[in-house]
């Protein structure tokens, strides 16, 4: 379980000619809000398909009124993040749609009017727990700047939020059958605990605290049998007397989706699946023409002068789809050699090479040791894009320029004296101590505090370990 978070930084006119008209006017003040829709995988799904990973609406932004004669500036934004909770594992690859909506606050009959200003879409790879990723998307003449990340909700951890961890109770090891939770060395995997009282026979869970029912059972703890014979409707709170499900009001009652859209319930609200040619929260946006800026990511719109004629988007390099909403993932072909990092800049591919490699695709292996000398008889060792010196005895440091003094760290305990030796160091122990570093006291009865003596040496032998 976890949360996808989206931070909108700015929404305003994009660079280049053809600045868009301000969406608000003195006669029609308005305010913006945003909607994000997430789908798992690098799907080729249409914009109308359900937001299987979840969706969220932002708060309304501040009211904005256009200043006459002024170009459209970056528009005032709603406060806070858009948060999309996900209950299951984070898929790692996902598709998103971010819609910018305008709420007109004039004297509309029946309340404010909503209209879709811009929609951007894309497909991305993202590991949970990573840093904020920044993005810029263009929809017609508009530009949206935003950041996003996915984070796990405790006790879930990992790049997919599938591992459960809890702090260790004992400093040394985890409980029976529980593994340490790498890379969090001070945490252990937690056993999965369902909602308290969840039926062990008819319920199950895959996330902490939940209780999902096997077929034929219902209720918060899966203790109520579903009796279909005398039930009228398959939805609603359970009736404790009959075990039936009695109908209750649902978000899709009365079908809030316009223009033939079909409604499906989501955990928090509803989702409209719109027929082709209609968009929006309730399928209320239709008749898209080139004037509406339907081509994303700098796509060129051709035709579509009136709502009855089709438009075609000519996509810039790196984008595809009927609205240029899909980014071509050219890095999936792994064009960068020798472990180089691939960057798809949209207009071009760039490879960021590891140290020791160069070239447009990191194909050239540089000689790491070229022009690099190791002092004092050291030899240069090439490897992994970096050079290192293997130093002669008595020398150390990156280039073997430092004289190594093995006794500098005072390695001999309990007053033992250190002597530099061609093979390293030797400790001459004070009376009553023994060991390679004089760390073990010799007991008066002849037994030492050694945990176990090396083969061939009794614990009481007054010899030094070298």
């Amino acid at each position: 379980a976890g949360v996808f978070e989206l931070q909108i930084h700015s929404f305003g006119p994009g660079p280049g000619p053809g600045a868009p008209r301000s969406p608000c006017s003195a006669r029609l003040p308005c305010r913006l809000f945003f909607r994000v829709c997430l789908k798992p995988g690098l799907s080729e799904e249409a914009a109308e398909s359900p937001c299987a990973l979840g969706a969220a609406l932002s708060a309304r932004g501040p009211v904005y009124t256009e200043q006459p004669g002024a170009p459209a500036p970056d528009l005032p934004l709603p406060d806070g993040l858009l948060q999309v909770p996900f209950r299951d594992a984070w898929p790692g690859t996902f598709s998103f749609i971010i819609e910018t909506w305008r709420e007109e606050l004039g004297d509309q009959i029946g309340g404010p009017a909503w209209s879709l200003l811009a929609r951007v879409a894309g497909r991305r790879r993202l590991a949970a727990g990573g840093p904020w990723a920044r993005d810029i998307q263009r929809a017609g003449a508009w530009e949206l700047r935003f950041s996003y990340r996915a984070r796990c909700e405790p006790p879930a951890v990992g790049t997919a939020c599938t591992r459960l961890c809890r702090p260790r109770s004992a400093p040394s090891r985890c409980g029976p059958g529980l593994r340490p939770c790498a890379p969090l060395e001070d945490e252990c995997e937690a056993p999965l605990v369902c909602r308290a009282g969840c039926s062990p026979e008819h319920g199950f869970c895959e996330q902490p605290g939940e209780c999902r029912c096997l077929e034929g059972w219902t209720g918060p703890l899966c203790t109520v049998p579903v009796s279909t014979s005398s039930c009228l409707s398959p939805r609603g709170p359970s009736s404790a007397t009959t075990g039936c499900l009695v109908p209750g009001p649902g978000p899709c009652d009365g079908n809030p989706c316009a223009n033939g859209g079909s409604c499906s319930e989501t955990p928090r609200s509803f989702e409209c699946t719109c027929p082709r040619g209609f968009y929006g929260l309730r399928c209320e946006v239709s008749g898209v023409t080139c004037a509406d800026g339907p081509c994303f990511n700098g796509g060129l719109c051709v035709g579509g002068a009136d709502p009855d004629s089709a438009y075609i988007c000519h996509c810039p390099p790196g984008f595809q789809g009927s609205n240029c909403e899909k980014r071509v993932d050219r890095c999936s072909l792994q064009p960068c050699r020798n472990g180089g990092l691939c960057l798809d800049l949209g207009h071009a591919l760039r490879c960021r090479c590891r140290a020791g490699f160069a070239g447009p695709r990191c194909e050239h292996d540089l000689d790491d040791c070229a022009g690099r000398a190791c002092a004092n008889g050291g030899t240069c060792v090439e490897g992994g894009g970096a050079h290192r010196c293997s130093c002669a005895l008595g020398f150390g440091g990156r280039d073997c320029r430092e004289r190594a003094d093995p006794c500098a760290a005072r390695p001999c305990a309990h007053g033992g004296r250190c002597y530099a030796h061609f093979s390293g160091l030797v400790c001459a122990c004070a009376p009553g101590y023994m060991g390679a570093r004089c760390e073990f006291p010799v007991h008066p009865d002849g037994a030492s505090a050694l945990p176990a003596a090396p083969p061939g040496l009794r614990p009481g032998d007054p010899q030094r370990y070298l």
């Epitope: 059958g177 056993p191 999965l192 605990v193 369902c194 969840c198 039926s199 062990p200 026979e201 008819h202 319920g203 199950f204 869970c205 895959e206 209780c211 096997l214 899966c222």
Partner: nanobody
Framework: EVQLVESGGGLVQPGGSLRLSCAAS????????MGWFRQAPGKEREGVAA????????LYADSVKGRFTISRDNSKNTLYLQMNSLRAEDTAVYYC????????????????????WGQGTLVTVSS
């Protein structure tokens, strides 16, 4: 420590039947789920059937519904899997699994639910 020992595997022709047994030694399993799992060469382990000891619930994977039956003889502390109308795709090593402390974590056909496993018995369906 519970030991689960499977038996009854072997070679059978398509359309034939086999009955697998799983004997639990040193411990009488009185509640919790027991299940049968299988793993074909080069494939992931999959849940086949599960039964709740001390209750009435039985569950089957879609691929075996109507052909396989899971049952339990409490007096013998033994789990059974009756396999009829066997197909070539049923060829696999079949494992018996037990959950000794009943709890609701994970679906009964999910291997993560079980903390004791047998060594497996090979079922080969071939003409």
């Amino acid at each position: 420590e519970v030991q689960l020992v499977e038996s009854g595997g072997g070679l059978v022709q398509p359309g034939g039947s086999l009955r697998l047994s799983c004997a639990a030694s040193t411990y009488t399993i009185s509640s919790g789920y027991m299940g049968w799992f299988r793993q074909a060469p080069g494939k992931e382990r999959e849940g086949v059937a599960a039964i709740y000891i001390g209750g009435s619930t039985t569950l089957y994977a879609d691929s075996v519904k109507g052909r396989f039956t899971i049952s339990r003889d409490n007096s013998k502390n033994t789990l059974y899997l009756q396999m009829n109308s066997l197909r070539a795709e049923d060829t696999a090593v079949y494992y018996c699994a037990a959950q000794l402390r009943p709890n609701s974590a994970y679906h009964p056909l999910d291997g993560r639910k079980y903390n004791y496993w047998g060594q497996g018995t090979l079922v080969t369906v071939s003409s």
